[in-house]
């Protein structure tokens, strides 16, 4: 495997593009299993209907790979644990991509992104042992291809969930 993006290995802030700029996705540090701060993106607008919060990564080179894999590790808060928000709270988010030769696209319209999948929490967990308790991170992997341009952007669309993106890794498999 060849890694093209690993959010956990980025030093300092990730600085991805959130839309809207306020009230949607927020970049937040949390502690990992080694008590090291890691950058996450979090959103939890479960009281307001019709949420449409976007988060866009920096440009990712494909390095000639025709098919890439996207591994997302995340925590999703159960709507049942949030009182009185059952009508507006969701438990999924959407994953998109946009191919581009331009590594500095300033503005990409929502309708230019191509949907990869709707992501939900399932039984695919990564076990993380921290002291006296076991944490469970949802892990989902999706693939995209064939790709033709020099690179691409990923985007995460929140539609009213309570979620923390803990890790985003993009990689391809060497032939």
């Amino acid at each position: 495997e060849v890694t093209l993006l690993d959010s956990r290995s980025v030093q300092g802030e990730l600085g991805w593009i959130a839309s809207p700029l306020e009230g949607g996705w927020e970049e937040v540090s949390i502690m990992d299993e080694k008590n090291t701060p890691i950058r996450t993106y979090q959103v939890c607008n479960v009281m307001e209907p019709s949420q449409n919060n976007w988060l866009r990564t920096d440009w990712i080179t494909r390095e000639g790979a025709q098919r890439v894999y996207i591994e997302i590790k995340f925590t999703l808060r159960d709507c049942n644990s949030l009182p009185g928000v059952m009508g507006t709270c969701k438990e999924t988010f959407n994953l998109y991509y946009y191919e581009s030769d331009n590594d500095k696209e300033r503005f990409i319209r929502e309708n230019q992104f191509v949907k990869i999948d709707t992501i939900a929490a399932d039984e695919s967990f990564t076990q993380v042992d921290i002291g006296d308790r076991i944490m469970k991170l949802n892990t989902e992997i999706r693939d995209v291809g064939p790709l033709s341009k020099k690179g691409f952007y990923l985007a995460f669309q929140d539609v009213g969930a309570c979620i923390a993106l803990v890790s985003v890794r993009v990689f391809y498999k060497k032939a």
Partner: nanobody
Framework: QVQLQESGGGLVQPGGSLRLSCAAS????????IYWVRQAPGKQRELVAA???????NYADSVKGRFTISTDDNKNTVYLQMNSLKSEDTAVYYC?????????????WGQGTQVTVSS
């Protein structure tokens, strides 16, 4: 030790105002979402107001335009200003601070403060 302590509840006439306070000790609010949640007698808990780490606020439809949530980071306190109170606002009001851990949720609750709106 993490603690949330609400205060400011009491008996008030319809149309009156109250300001609830929630003081935190053992942690700082800036890492958490802060919720005010209420529970009326015989009813389920209801999320009333929320504020994010960067100060973005949300309100339940039933209190929009009447209630205001705010924080004072220096005092590590969150407030709920309640104006134009109605009898249906009668409930125990709880302060809730929560945040994401790695693969888990950190969730703290206060003991609650009673608000009674009655003439």
């Amino acid at each position: 030790q993490v603690q949330l302590q609400e205060s400011g509840g009491g008996l008030v006439q319809p149309g009156g105002s109250l300001r609830l306070s929630c003081a935190a000790s053992g942690f700082t609010f800036s890492r958490y979402w802060i919720y005010w949640v209420r529970q009326a007698p015989g009813k389920q808990r209801e999320l009333v107001a929320a504020i994010t780490r960067n100060g973005v606020t949300n309100y339940a439809d039933s209190v929009k335009g009447r209630f205001t949530i705010s924080t004072d980071d220096n005092k590590n306190t969150v407030y709920l200003q309640m104006n134009s109170l109605k009898s249906e606002d009668t409930a125990v009001y709880y302060c809730n601070a929560w945040g994401f851990l790695l693969g888990d949720i950190e969730d703290y609750w206060g003991q609650g403060t009673q608000v009674t709106v009655s003439s």
